[in-house]
């Protein structure tokens, strides 16, 4: 390595380019400066993302993949660096950018929201799971009436265009449904969604957004909820939701509502059963909901509550109609 009294001048990388390699994905590439003397030192590169969101990182190789929204444009810089116990040196920056795509901002969609849901694949002999995707949006305030929007998603290396749209009264696409996708429900990749558009009257600005699966995955409610009363013991059991996550990956909430006095008990659990001490004069309705535990994935959404189950004394039964 460089000694404290040695001097080396660092030169910026050359041929720095940004290539769009997929939906919301770019490849940054550069070459070492051919005039850079190496002198047995460990040179690295510092990549700085300037826009749309500031970030930086180091790498020893001459390319870098970046997952990022592109509808606001994209700008990055790279420089050669040398950092050790007695040196801190950096070259000037080499920079490149992608301009924002054409079309005024008001023509692009707004309020894009997406949710995923898991179903069991009944066509397969092995237990496997399918992930559906549903997205909705609002038409841009400056979009001409003849605007038509088109949605695409990318997950990993898979990109698909929507085939099933819902439309507004003017026939413009405002929602999309993929019954089956290439999304892996236990995956940790970003889900990239792009909505572009066309109009005879003006350019329509595309809009892309990145979603973390844990934040949009609508967990199914627990299955086969049962409740029994033995004396003053209310025993509740259930099965894990339809999900690619295994049994140990769920947190549960049990809601016990005493319909006689209105008292509501909510318990948070990590097991598939719960016993509560109750009075045997009341009627109860019981519901359970689930969420993927933070042991298995970042905190996300709770499922809907399961359908209520009614147990207990039913003195005030409505008269049965004959």
């Amino acid at each position: 390595d460089l000694l404290p009294d040695e001097k080396i001048s660092l030169l910026p990388p050359v041929n720095f380019t940004i290539k769009v390699t997929g939906l919301a994905q770019v490849l940054l590439q550069w070459k070492p400066n051919p005039d850079q003397e190496q002198r047995n030192v460990n040179l690295e590169y510092q990549v700085k993302i300037n826009a749309p969101k500031e970030d930086d990182y180091e790498t020893r190789i001459t390319e870098s993949k970046c997952v990022t929204i592109l509808h606001k444009g994209f700008s990055a810089s790279v420089r050669t660096i040398l950092q050790n116990d007695h040196s801190l040196l950096a070259s000037s920056w080499a920079s490149a950018e992608l301009h924002a795509p054409p079309g005024s901002p008001g023509t692009s969609i707004v309020n894009l929201t997406c949710t995923t849901n898991t179903t069991e694949d009944n066509y397969s002999r092995l237990r496997s799971y399918q992930v559906s995707l549903h997205c909705t949006w609002l038409v841009g305030t400056d979009a001409p009436e003849d605007t038509q929007y088109f949605l695409y998603y990318r997950y990993g290396s898979w990109t698909e265009e929507c085939q099933e749209y819902s439309k507004d009264t003017l026939g413009r696409n405002i929602a999309c449904w993929f019954p089956r996708t290439f999304i892996l429900s236990k995956g940790r990749d970003w889900l990239a969604v792009l909505v572009n558009g066309s109009s005879k009257h003006s350019a329509i600005r595309p809009f892309d957004q990145l979603f973390a699966l844990h934040a949009i995955d609508q967990i199914n409610p627990p299955l086969n909820v049962t409740a029994e009363i033995e004396g003053t013991r209310l025993s509740i059991q259930w099965e894990k939701p339809v999900s690619a996550f295994p049994i140990h990956c769920f947190d549960y909430e049990v809601k016990i509502h005493n319909t006689r006095n209105g008292y509501l008990q909510i318990e948070k659990l990590m097991t598939n059963a719960f016993i509560s001490i109750i009075d045997d004069l009341s009627k109860y309705d019981v519901q359970v909901r689930a969420a993927v535990s933070s042991m298995c994935r970042e905190a996300g959404l709770w499922s809907e509550w399961s359908q209520p189950i009614y147990v207990g004394n039913d003195e005030h039964k409505p008269l049965r109609e004959w």
Epitope: Q46, D55, D56, Y57, Q83, H86, L88, L89, A90, A212
Partner: antibody, heavy 118, light 107 residues
Framework: EVQLQQSGAELVKPGASVNLSCTAS????????MHWVKQRPEQGLEWIGR????????KSDPKFQAKATIAADTSSNTAYLQLSSLTSEDTAVYYC???????????WGQGTTLTVSS | QIVLTQSPAIMSASPGEKVTMTCSAS?????MHWYQQKSGTSPKRWIY???KLASGVPARFSGSGSGTSYSLTISSMEAEDAATYYC??????????FGGGTKLEIK
């Protein structure tokens, strides 16, 4: 050797202003981001803000925007923190810190103790 | 702003004991960084980008985590490890925030 040398301790009256300095040796500050961090007695660390000395761009915690002004002079390789309208709440050790990266702090000065007292 | 909560606030360990301290973020962060500070001295960069050891940091230290949950572990406590450890996150929208610190004492 890479070093950050901060100015000496300050005792100032409430309502006054103070200018703290941090001079780098062993590197050019224009190659780095220079940050200022506050530590009140027996307390944790609070980020005040940063400057990119190459272009003068600054970013700071909104909480300190009315209180602190960060500047840099690349010719003297020095970063500055100016604190105004001082109160006893500003009594603290102020560290200058910086490095090549935005995300974290490679090098730290020895700290400047500021005491605000009448 | 992202709030970092360190636990425990104070802990003590015997020489040779394994030590783990945690840092919990109020929302997801990409990386966590850790600093060691001994009384009356400046903080030192200790672990950066979640798991990389700064120059000169003994190999008994390690860092791990993702999302909202991060930790610093010492595989075998030594007397020189007694210090306060701060976690720190960076997000592209200021501010940078630190945890409240974990003070590690030797038994």
């Amino acid at each position: 050797e890479v070093q950050l040398q901060q100015s000496g301790a300050e005792l100032v009256k409430p309502g006054a202003s103070v200018n703290l300095s941090c001079t780098a040796s062993g590197f050019n500050i224009k190659d780095t981001y220079m940050h200022w961090v506050k530590q009140r007695p027996e307390q944790g660390l609070e980020w005040i803000g940063r400057i990119d000395p190459a272009n003068g761009n600054t970013k700071s915690d909104p909480k300190f925007q009315a209180k602190a002004t960060i500047a840099a002079d690349t010719s003297s390789n020095t970063a500055y923190l100016q604190l105004s309208s001082l109160t006893s709440e500003d009594t603290a050790v102020y560290y200058c810190t910086g490095g090549l990266r935005l995300r974290f702090f490679d090098y730290w000065g020895q700290g400047t103790t500021l005491t605000v007292s009448s | 702003q992202i709030v970092l909560t360190q636990s425990p606030a104070i802990m003590s360990a015997s020489p040779g004991e394994k030590v783990t301290m945690t840092c919990s973020a109020s929302s997801s962060v990409s990386y966590m960084h850790w600093y060691q500070q001994k009384s009356g001295t400046s903080p030192k960069r200790w672990i950066y980008d979640t798991s990389k050891l700064a120059s000169g940091v003994p190999a008994r230290f390690s860092g791990s985590g993702s999302g909202t949950s991060y930790s610093l572990t010492i595989s075998s406590m030594e007397a020189e490890d007694a210090a306060t450890y701060y976690c720190q996150q960076w997000s592209s929208n200021p501010p940078i925030t630190f945890g409240g610190g974990t003070k590690l004492e030797i038994k």
